[in-house]
Structures are given as C-alpha cells and as structure tokens.
Interface confidence: low
C-alpha cells in the first residue's frame, strides 16, 4: 500500500533504535571519511525529521522519497567538496541519477587504519560511560570500512557485541571473557560482509537473473522439502531485499527483510521444519537465524532427475515455452538433491544443461542428442572434486603457512602484474580456506572450499576493477560469475609478462624483522617470495625451495646472532647474490 510519508512509515515499522542505527549505517557507508560526531549530528537531524513526519505525514518534505531526503542531507554538507572531491559533482544531478552517482563513489578499499580493538579495561569503561554511543561507534567504524555490509545483519552483530560487553565487563577476568567472544563476532562479521559483497556484485555486474539463479540453488539446498513455487516466492522477495540494501536503501531493505522473515515463519510448514527454532526469536535474531539455518533433511523417494529432464518427451517443448521456469525447475531439483555441491558447481551444471538443450532442441532428433547429457556434465563435478582433493592434500602436507607460500607462487605466476601486497593478501586468504575447509567431512569440503573461494575471488575482482593491471584477471572476473573460479584455476604462467628487474631492496632485511609478531614476519617473507617469482616467473619448484631454505636459514642465523644488524648487513648481500646465482 502507498504511504503518504515513506520515512514515517519506515520509522513506525522499524522503531526508533533500529531506525537510528540504519541511518547511521547509511551515512557511514556513503561518507566514509567523515568523523563520527558529524554523522551523529546528521542522524539526530534525520530522526527528528522522521518523528515530525510521524506526527504529521503532510508536513513539508515528508512526502519525499527517502533516497531524496538522504541525498539532500548529504549535498547540504558544507565541506563536501573539500573532503570528498568529485563526489560533490553528484549533487548537480537529479534523482535517480544522483543516487547512482553516490553509489559509484563508495570505496571498497578506503584508506583507513585497521579497526583496532582497545584493551578490555578501556573497552568496558567506554561502554559503561555511554553504551548507545559506544555501539553507534561500532556501527560507524564497521560501515565505513565495509560500505556494502548487509545493514540489518550489522545491527544483529552490534547487538551481539553489546551482549558480550554487558556480560564480560562484569567478569573478574574481562579479557578471558571478551577475547573469544569478540574474535568470533569479528570472524563471522567479515564473512557476512564478503557474502553480501558477492550478492551485490552479482546483481550489479551480472544482473537479476544471475542473482536469482544463485538464490534458487542456495534455498533449494537448504529447504529441499519446499515446492519450487514456494522457493520462487522467497527468491522474488529476497531479490527485492538484496537490491534495496545493495542500492543503499537500507530502511526499506531492513523493513522488507522483516516482512520476508515474517512470511517464512507464517509458512514454515511448507518450507522447512528447521524454521521452528528461528521463528520464536526477536526480529534481528529471527532473520539472522533464518539466514544461517541448517539445511532440512532430504525428502525420501525423490525420483531420478533423468525422468523429467532427459526421458520426458516434452523436454524441448517445456524448454521452448517457458525457458526460465523450466531451467529454474532443473536447478531446484538438482540443488535439493545435492547439498554437498557448491553453488558455483550447481550453476555451472544448469548452464551446461541449458547449452545442451539450446543445441539439441534445434536438431532433427533432440532426444538422441541430449540422451547422455548427465554423462557429459560429469566433468563439471569431477574437476572441482579433484582440485579440492589435491589442494587439501597439499595443505595437509605443508600446513597453513607453507600452503600460503605455494599459493603465493601459483597466483604470482598467473597474474604477475598484480601488486605484491595484493598477491600476498590473497595467497594468505586462499591459504586460510585450507584451514577452514580441509578438516571438514568429505560431504562438506567441496561446497565449503568453492563457496569461500567465490568470496575471495570476488574481492580480488572488485579491487582489480578499480586499478586493472592484468587482462587475464579482468577476463576471469568479467566473463562469467559462475566460471570465475575455474577460469582462475586454468590460468598458468603468464607467458607475455616481462620479468621485473631484480631490486636488491625487495630482498633487504633488517634486525627489526626478528621482533615482529609471527603473522607480520610471515607477510614480510611472503612479500619477498612474490618479488622473487616476479623476477623469475619460470623458476622451478626446486629452485624456489632452495632459495626459500637459504632465506629461512639466513633469518634464523641473524635473529639468533648477538649483533643482529651487523649480521643482516654482512650476510644480506651474500644471500641476494646466492639467490641470483640459484635462479640464474
């Protein structure tokens, strides 16, 4: 139904607390450099305005679209141009162009210091002084670093954060109580951020059809007892919610998400028995619980897929008459039967099936042409299975750090034009997938690995789009969302790359490395490894092993020496010369 005042409607639906949180997230995600105090001032102004509209929906400006109200607020900031440069040019545009323009200026990699966690004592003091302000600060700091974070989920994490502090700040050992809780929240929130970023990229770069296909596969795996019509209904609502959040319409998104959760709880009998435990929870927890829900058991006696999709004489007729519905049904039926497959695999299989029908249904004897379609799709299942097996074996053999090094070499050879810090960051992220997934049972390994890789490669693609340096990366990132991972896997040494000249600086170390925390020490060594590969992309595994061994021995020797700096100064150049000789 249409409301006289959209902002009043959302304020009433969401309540003041959530409304303020969402306004703060909206502003922080768009104006990532502004200080917290400036945002608080704007949040209070928007909230006061919304309250005035609740009192009188016909009051001045209350009828305006929420995006227009936000845009007007942003464009009224006096220091906008000096702080944000060309973002201020958006203000010369009319909505909806202005909204699009703001979106294009969101920075996925803002130049902000890492979000450091203060000591437990300091945390608790600040929290006790003013817990609303403290939680507001958390929303602000996360939002400006993650401008596509799923806003209603961020409210959930803020609530978890608040609960952890409420409990632990009363504990005798605050650190022992807080550290594991906050670590867990941080890890989950980072994954949540990456998941939402992939959804937004899917919508923005590949369109609604790609996102809907992704959603059908995921929901069919989770709710295998639900009918296709039910899955389709949920997917339609979910697409609307996701589009709103990705577009920065966070109040609408959060409100519609509440509605979707309510709908699913009202129809839980026809969706999943697992919804029961979620539906008794309060709003934020309910929606989060549904998002994270365990998959339902498979219905018994499911007929063989071939019955409807190969043997049925009407296959081509059904395909021609309602292509998307027929392919959607195929994806639904295949996904609900294969909870152990990754989303990417399921979508590649559906794509393969579609391509086969496109070809066969134009032939004289379609059935003879597509009769062996499932056999022909088998490589799409075997390739990732084999890849996961090989990589997990390598991970088991080398451990996380050694596995990261192997990946650093591999990815530098694939895309040597990418900057060294970026290659190290991604090798480390890809390496940690081994830790997350390789210890899982066989049935979960495959989906865990590919689904995580999709998140990591998406981040790589987003940052590479900002400053592209490798056509091969651009090609893998833009040609097909579902084929990104196979495309990267298929890349080998870039034969066209001109090796980087040898810079002794890249391999010069000082005594300060000895006192660095282990993680930072690893990063330094991995930077040198990547530089080495850029210098000699075709070096053999043996040569690399020798150089890395010499390098480790050099670090150990000098870090154990009495006069560390003298050791680094004297032995460093010798090591460099030795490495050059090894790689010559």
């Amino acid at each position: 139904e249409a409301h006289k005042s959209e902002i009043a409607h959302r304020f009433n639906d969401l309540g003041e607390g959530h409304f303020k949180g969402l306004v703060l997230i909206t502003l922080s995600q768009h104006l990532q450099k502004s200080p917290f105090e400036e945002h608080v001032k704007l949040v209070n102004e928007v909230t006061d305005f919304a309250k005035a509209c609740v009192a009188d929906e016909s009051a001045q400006n209350c009828g305006k679209a929420i995006a227009t109200l936000f845009g007007d607020k942003v464009c009224a900031i006096p220091s906008l141009r000096e702080t944000y440069g060309e973002l201020a040019d958006c203000c010369a545009k009319e909505d909806p162009d202005r909204v699009e323009c703001f979106l294009q200026h969101k920075d996925d990699n803002p130049n902000l210091p890492p979000f450091e966690r203060p000591e437990p004592e300091a945390l608790c003091t600040a929290f006790k002084e003013n817990n609303d302000r403290f939680i507001g600060h958390y929303l602000y700091e996360v939002s400006r670093r993650h401008p596509y974070f799923y806003a209603p989920e961020l409210l959930y994490y803020a609530e978890k954060y608040k609960n952890a502090l409420t409990e632990c700040c009363e504990a005798a050992d605050k650190a022992a109580c807080l550290t594991p809780k906050l670590d867990a929240i941080k890890e989950k929130a980072l994954v949540s951020s990456a998941q939402q970023r992939l959804k937004c990229a899917s919508l923005q770069k590949f369109g609604e059809r790609a996102f809907k296909a992704w959603s059908v596969a995921r929901l069919s795996q989770k709710f295998p007892k639900a009918e296709f019509a039910e899955i389709s209904t949920i997917v339609t609502s979910l697409t609307k919610v996701t589009k709103e959040c990705c577009h920065g319409d966070l109040l609408e998104c959060a409100d519609d998400r509440q509605e979707l959760a309510k709908y699913m709880c009202e129809h839980q009998d026809s969706i999943s028995s697992k919804l029961k435990e979620c539906c008794v929870k309060p709003t934020l927890q309910k929606a989060h619980c549904i998002l994270e829900i365990q998959r339902d058991e498979l219905p018994t006696e499911l007929p063989d897929l071939a019955v409807d999709f190969v043997e049925d004489k009407e296959v081509c007729k059904n395909f021609a008459e309602a292509k998307d519905v027929f392919l959607g049904t195929f994806l639904y039926e295949y996904s609900r039967r294969h909870p152990e497959y990754s989303i990417g695999m399921l979508l590649r299989i559906a794509k393969g099936y579609e391509a086969k029908l496109e070809k066969c249904c134009a032939e004289a004897d379609p059935h003879a042409c597509y009769a062996k379609v499932f056999d022909e799709l088998q490589p799409l299942i075997d390739e990732p299975k084999k890849l996961v097996q090989q990589n997990c074996e390598l991970f088991d053999k080398l451990g996380e750090y050694g596995f990261q090094n192997a990946l650093a070499v591999r990815y530098t050879q694939k895309a040597p034009q990418v900057s060294t810090p970026t290659l190290v960051e991604y090798a480390r992220k890809l390496g940690s997938v081994g830790t997350k997934c390789c210890s899982l049972p066989e049935t979960e390994r495959l989906s865990c690995t590919e689904n995580y890789l999709a998140l990591i490669l998406n981040r790589l693609c987003i940052l590479h789009e900002k400053t592209p340096v490798s056509e091969r990366v651009t090609k893998c990132c833009t040609e097909s969302l579902v084929n990104r991972r196979p495309c990267f896997s298929a890349l080998h040494v870039d034969e066209t790359y001109v090796p980087k000249p040898f810079h002794a600086d890249s391999f010069t170390f000082h005594a300060d490395i000895c006192t660095l925390p282990e993680k930072e020490k690893q990063v330094k060594k991995q930077m040198a490894l990547v530089e080495l590969v850029k210098h000699k992309p075709k070096a053999s595994e043996e040569q690399m092993k020798t150089v890395m061994g010499d390098f480790a021995a050099f670090l150990k020797k000098c870090c154990d020496a009495d006069n560390k700096e003298a050791c680094f100064t004297e032995d460093g150049p010798k090591l460099v010369a030795k490495c050059q000789a090894t790689l010559a």
């Epitope: 789009e465 592209p468 340096v469 870039d494 034969e495 066209t496 790359y497 001109v498």
Partner: nanobody, 115 residues
C-alpha cells in the same frame, strides 16, 4: 579492437631528451594500468615503467629512475614517457603495453642514443 600506436622516437645524442607518446583506442583507457617496455637489439624485453589507471601511482626500473617520467592524459587516451639524460644503453625499441603484457602492445618506436 585494441590499438596502441607509439610515436616520438628518433636519434638523439647522449644527454639529450625525447618524449614518447602512445595513442590508445578500443578499450576503456582509464580502467587500465599502462607500462612502457623496451627491447634492445638482440636482447630480451625489459620493463621500464608503469602507471595506474588514474595516473596516481607510478613505478620505474632502477636503470631509468630519476631520468624518465611516465604520465598519461586520460582525456586524450594517451600515455607518455619523458626521457631525459639519455644514455647509449637506452637505445631500444620502446613499446607501450596494457599492464605489463607484451601481448597487448603496439608496433613500437625506435630510440637511438648515439654521438
């Protein structure tokens, strides 16, 4: 189709200067980092310098640092290399490339430094 056309090469005395240009077309110029790569007669290709899509980040090989300056004019889809204090060892064919890939380069422009 991607096209890169280098110009500005020639014969110059040691210590002299030249400015190379590279006109680009067939792709979104602002979206790609660009590089200059050179190849001396009878030698392998050598990377010289790179610049990011926006022009804010630049990188130079040690052999040219302080003498060469890479720049770009995104409104003209053109990449430049200002070469000062030229030496005989700078004699080579200079190619402009997308990223650092020789597979995406022009025909090159010959620079000869000789007295």
């Amino acid at each position: 189709d991607v096209q890169l056309v280098e110009s500005g090469g020639g014969v110059v005395q040691p210590g002299g200067s030249l400015r190379l240009s590279c006109a680009a077309s067939g792709f979104t110029f602002t979206s790609f980092g660009m590089s200059w790569v050179r190849q001396a007669p009878g030698k392998g290709p050598e990377w010289v310098s790179s610049i990011s899509g926006s022009g804010s980040d630049t990188l130079y090989a040690d052999s040219v640092k302080g003498r060469f300056t890479i720049s770009r004019d995104n409104s003209k889809n053109t990449l430049y290399l200002q070469m000062n204090s030229l030496r005989p060892e700078d004699t080579a064919t200079y190619y402009c490339t997308i990223g650092g890939s020789l597979s995406r380069s022009g025909q090159g422009t010959l620079v000869t430094v000789s007295s």
